[in-house]
Interface confidence: low
Amino acid sequence: ASVIYVYVQDYRSPFIASVSDQHGVVYITENKNKTVVIPCLGSISNLNVSLCARYPEKRFVPDGNRISWDSKKGFTIPSYMISYAGMVFCEAKINDESYQSIMYIVVVVGYRIYDVVLSPSHGIELSVGEKLVLNCTARTELNVGIDFNWEYPSSKHQHKKLVNRDLKTQSGSEMKKFLSTLTIDGVTRSDQGLYTCAASSGLMTKKNSTFVRVHEKPFVAFGSGMESLVEATVGERVRIPAKYLGYPPPEIKWYKNGIPLESNHTIKAGHVLTIMEVSERDTGNYTVILTNPISKEKQSHVVSLVVYVP
């Protein structure tokens, strides 16, 4: 659409009165790189116009660079220069007479997003039918509105639920928090993949991603590299890791010659079987049994420990 300006030069009313009421609103950010235009248009094109901001009272004059006035556009100024002000107006001097535009109320809007955090952030594993809950938290400066956008493998999912809300932050704080929660009630194999949450404030977008792994059903198995024979010399520390694949993580139990091993100051029987100072009597067959906590499926593996006396 083209705009035609017809100048009716009126030295008693150099600023074009807005059809709206007695004041306007200008929205600004404190971004150092942004300028704002105060739309005090002129009926005379070659006026000497300054911008008055209050409170405290400050006057800005065109500097031929980032501060300028154009009768068809208004007064342009870096927004951070008037971010302190409650109101601004344009002023023209004609024959020692001062003429003022309408008042413009200054409303500072934020834009900075400090970070976007996904929770859980990594290592998400589920089996088919389980519920996936992902929280995306954006921390921003004050006076920011946030739009969340999620990208994930089956974005058309019928069972997904998205809830966005503002989190309460301390009154003395320099930041706001926004939370978006993605819930998929019963995941399928097609829900496996990369989940990305993007938060946008209009001027800035930040995003974060995490990988979700979906298993057909709970399972447990020994991983490759699980040793069958371990050799050691008296006095050494022996570590026998239980290398497994499984979801959810299995319960691990160690046995020696069929007798359950309990952890004490000389032996630690957990994800890794550790014998602090191995002795001749530690020689024997060690069995590790992995139990899936959901399906109760069990897998066992025998490791022979041979201890040499130097």
Epitope: E30, Y84, G110, T169, G172, S173
Partner: antibody, heavy 117, light 107 residues
Framework: QVNLRESGGGLVKPGGSLRLSCAAS????????MNWVRQAPGKGLEWVAS????????FYTDSVKGRFTISRDNSRSSLFLQMNSLRAEDTAIYYC??????????WGQGTMVTVSS | DIQMTQSPSSLSASVGDRVTITCKAS??????LNWYQQKPGEAPKLLIY???ILETGVPSRFSGSGSGTDFTFTISSLQPEDIATYYC?????????FGGGTKLEIK
Amino acid sequence: QVNLRESGGGLVKPGGSLRLSCAASGFTFGSYTMNWVRQAPGKGLEWVASITSGSSYIFYTDSVKGRFTISRDNSRSSLFLQMNSLRAEDTAIYYCARGSASAFDIWGQGTMVTVSS
Amino acid sequence: DIQMTQSPSSLSASVGDRVTITCKASDDIINYLNWYQQKPGEAPKLLIYDASILETGVPSRFSGSGSGTDFTFTISSLQPEDIATYYCQQLDDIPITFGGGTKLEIK
């Protein structure tokens, strides 16, 4: 070394004015909310005013609204408190304090303001 | 306004004693509560923020707990240098308010 140093206190008559200053050093002043807190002789702490990093938000306690003005100059790492129409009950040590997201973590040593005829 | 009621207003204890101060908020302030120590003639010093987090460099004998409206500040083993007035402060809402203070003395 993070430091806040107040100045500008003194003796003033009721109805008079004073301007307190707080000079900051050792940290990025323009990134923090700044606060004024006062303590009347023998009394507890009372929050007076806060100003956010870019001066976009300013808050006052009810008893000083319309009389006190908090401001800052980030280019000079300075915080100010313009106090007008002073009353006897404004007599106190005035502290400036840095506001982190959670607390007032750095305090100045304070400047004494006495309002008396 | 959120009122902060601190008790006791003063207390006397012996070196090595466990000392407890309580602070009650007139409204739910989640965990936006801080504890400060002020020694005579000095500025206040932050000890604990967010109800229970120890400020860097503060001895571990100081601790804080609580959420909502009821909060507790504890010195596990009182030392002579702990003689001071202690204040709680809420940062949940404007106006920011402090408790009336607890003056701690050595028996």
